[in-house]
């Protein structure tokens, strides 16, 4: 997180740390699902059980955390790893339910009315242990409040080289300051960009940290997030089809996706 | 030639009557007859909220047949009050006996609730009654447990710390 501040206990109780070759993040849904970015878990597709999932802690290196393991990973069938970041969304089913408390609480999915809290200039909050402006991964969970950026303005920002045309799709939303300095960065991938629903007084996930400019927090460039509201049917279908309850059973973790495997691509928010 | 006629013996027999079937408490015999003889039968029907049991074992129906030696081919079952048994534990919740401590028989009421703050009850209001079929049943007719679903979106940033 660029230009952020340290999170306090209970601020982001849905925050999940995903370790598996690289550092990434996710957000707890219900008590046995994690919402994350497809690119953050793609590299572990052959061994989803190798994902080390940690929650209930502020400190990235702390030995005090709640451990969870993956039972199955579901990558959006429209995600293509070497061709942009459209449909950059994935779900991890945990093999056991986690106990909910003040430090581990799921994030809400957006209601139909949620778009009224996600208009241009509305403030969202990104959190993570990714790179800070000092150039290192954060030891303490960091967060930053950033405004939503007009979609056309964001599309225009990413139409000049080195970005291919059409990088920003309708399945993405952008957030950040035109002047730069506040952004998510490498290592924050998969984490939630959350918004406060002022009617219910509950936080919901509006975006998933996906990609951005080569230099995080760059002026005139913005962080790009998967637009979660576009994927509510996809999320709900998977959760209903593959069960709410963690089985707790043995067996190897499954990796589910509806596409052929392609060569891995790297992007600045991957790690 | 004189005709010969053999002996003619007339047999008469009285079938042994079986003992009169006394209905078990909370049950009745059908059909009711003055007496029951060979091949006659009776069935036992229990009142609502009671079930046929032979010892610990449940029966859906019971019919006994009178045998030639004057005994019934099956012993009389009992009509025992339906017992739904201890309710299942509710993950992230608890159960309270409303009718009385540990009472799990017909028409007994229990109340499920979820752990405060972090869980909320889905599916129904958590009130279940022991019905005549032996299942704990919600007011909506569900025999499955309610669900304690985690409350989402709580944060110390809006609740001023916990």
């Amino acid at each position: 997180i660029y230009g952020g501040q340290k999170a306090k206990p209970g601020d982001f109780p849905w925050q999940v740390l995903i370790l598996g070759g690289t550092t990434a993040a996710g957000a707890l849904l219900y008590d046995n699902w994690v919402l994350t970015a497809a690119h953050a878990v793609y590299e572990q597709k052959h061994d989803a059980s190798a994902l080390d999932i940690r929650m209930g802690t502020l400190k990235r290196l702390s030995p005090h955390y709640t451990q969870a393991w993956s039972e199955a990973v579901f990558i959006h069938e429209g995600y293509t790893h070497d061709a942009g970041f459209d449909n950059d969304i994935a779900l991890i089913k945990l093999n056991n339910k986690v106990v909910i408390n003040s430090n581990i609480t799921p994030i809400c999915l957006p209601r139909k009315e949620a778009e009224s809290f996600m208009r241009t200039d509305d403030i969202g909050t990104a959190s993570g242990w990714g790179l800070t402006q000092r150039g290192f991964l954060a030891r303490n969970l960091m967060y930053v409040d950033i405004p939503i950026v007009d979609h056309q303005k964001c599309t225009a920002a990413y139409e000049k080289p080195p970005y291919p045309r059409g990088s920003v799709t309708a399945n993405m939303l952008c957030a950040g300051l035109e002047s730069g300095g506040k952004d998510s960065c490498r290592g924050d991938s998969g984490g939630a960009l959350v918004f406060l629903d002022s009617e219910t007084e509950r936080w919901f996930v509006g975006g998933i940290v996906s990609w951005g400019s080569m230099n995080c927090g760059e002026a005139g460039q913005y962080g790009v997030y998967t637009k979660v509201i576009n994927y509510i049917p996809w999320i709900e279908n998977i959760i209903s089809d593959f069960g709410g309850g963690g089985s707790g059973g043995g067996g190897s973790a499954k990796f589910v996706a509806a596409w052929t495997l392609k060569a891995a691509a790297h992007h600045h928010h991957h790690h | 030639m004189a005709s010969m006629t053999g002996w003619k013996i007339h047999y008469t027999s009285t079938a042994h009557a079986c003992p009169y079937p006394m209905a078990p408490p909370n049950g009745h015999v059908s059909p009711v007859q003055a007496k029951y003889i060979l091949k006659d039968s009776f069935s036992i029907f229990c009142e609502t909220g009671y079930e046929l049991l032979q010892g610990h074992l449940p029966l859906k129906s019971f019919t006994a047949v009178c045998q030639k030696d004057g005994s019934w081919d099956r012993p009389m079952p009992a009509c025992s009050i339906v017992d739904c048994g201890p309710p299942d534990d509710l993950p992230s919740g608890r159960v309270e006996y409303i009718t009385g401590p540990g009472v799990t028989t017909y028409k007994a009421v229990i109340q499920y609730s979820c752990e405060e703050t972090f869980y909320t009850m889905k599916v129904n209001d958590g009130k279940y009654v022991c019905e005549a079929d032996g299942f704990w049943t919600s007011s909506k007719g569900e025999k499955s447990l309610p669900v304690c679903e985690p409350v989402c979106g709580l944060s110390a940033r809006t609740t001023g710390g916990r």
Epitope: - | Q54, G55, H56, L57, P58, L59, K60, S61, R74, P75, G85, D133, G134, F135
Partner: antibody, heavy 114, light 107 residues
Framework: DVQLQESGPGLVKPSQSLSLTCTVT?????????WNWIRQFPGNKLEWMGY???????SYNPSLKSRISITRNTSTNQFFLQLNSVTTEDTATYFC???????WGQGTTLTVSS | DIVMTQSQKFMSTSVGDRVSVTCKAS??????VAWFQQKPGQSPKPLIY???YRYSGVPDRFTGSGSGTDFTLTISNVQSEDLAEYFC?????????FGAGTKLELN
């Protein structure tokens, strides 16, 4: 004629779950009676494990209650035993039986071993 | 749990003899007792239910008696095919329990 037939894996590793099936022919498991699982240990000791009744209600031996589940599939006329976290002590011959106890399956031998 | 005690692990008999296998319940089980016969490699075969009622097809040389806590299976005119292990079983009270068995052997 009523017949019961058990089927299962034969060998299970410790800490795993055991699943057995009892297939009933000649009588519907929803018509009447309690449909039981009974096991016999080496040395011939018999233990009643539990039953599922014609109505679908279950009753379990309290010694097993935390790890046993008996379910049924009425369309295939089968009932099932699941026993979790097995140990070598669960090595036995498993029988399914209709109660009154008048019909028993032939039994299936289960060995728990690593 | 109700304990069903079959005090004799083995009983010796001869073909044509009359033999009585006994079983004692640790508490009152009414008449809710059954008897089973088991031969090696076979499943238990039901003989008697409700203490004294024979299952259909069971020869009438097998007779059950008793109620409350004391039960007896009597085999009159023992045949060679009767050499087997006999188990008593109570189904009056949860959980259902079995006796340890009595093996009938030839003298």
């Amino acid at each position: 004629d009523v017949q019961l037939q058990e089927s299962g894996p034969g060998l299970v590793k410790p800490s795993q779950s055991l699943s057995l099936t009892c297939t009933v022919t000649g009588y519907s498991i929803t018509s009447d009676y309690a449909w039981n699982w009974i096991r016999q240990f080496p040395g011939n000791k018999l233990e009643w494990m539990g039953y599922i009744s014609y109505s679908g209600r279950t009753s379990y031996n309290p010694s097993l209650k935390s790890r046993i589940s008996i379910t049924r599939n009425t369309s295939t006329n089968q009932f099932f035993l699941q026993l979790n976290s097995v140990t070598t002590e669960d090595t036995a011959t498993y029988f399914c039986a209709r109660y009154w106890g008048d019909y028993w399956g032939q039994g299936t031998t289960l060995t728990v071993s690593s | 749990d109700i304990v069903m005690t079959q005090s004799q692990k083995f009983m010796s008999t001869s073909v044509g003899d009359r033999v009585s296998v006994t079983c004692k319940a640790s508490q009152n089980v009414g008449s809710n007792v059954a008897w089973f016969q088991q031969k090696p490699g076979q499943s238990p075969k039901p003989l008697i239910y409700s203490a004294s009622y024979r299952y259909s097809g069971v020869p009438d040389r097998f007779t059950g008696s008793g109620s409350g806590t004391d039960f007896t299976l009597t085999i009159s005119n023992v045949q060679s095919e009767d050499l087997a292990e006999y188990f008593c079983h109570q189904y009056n009270t949860y959980p259902l329990t079995f006796g340890a068995g009595t093996k009938l052997e030839l003298n």
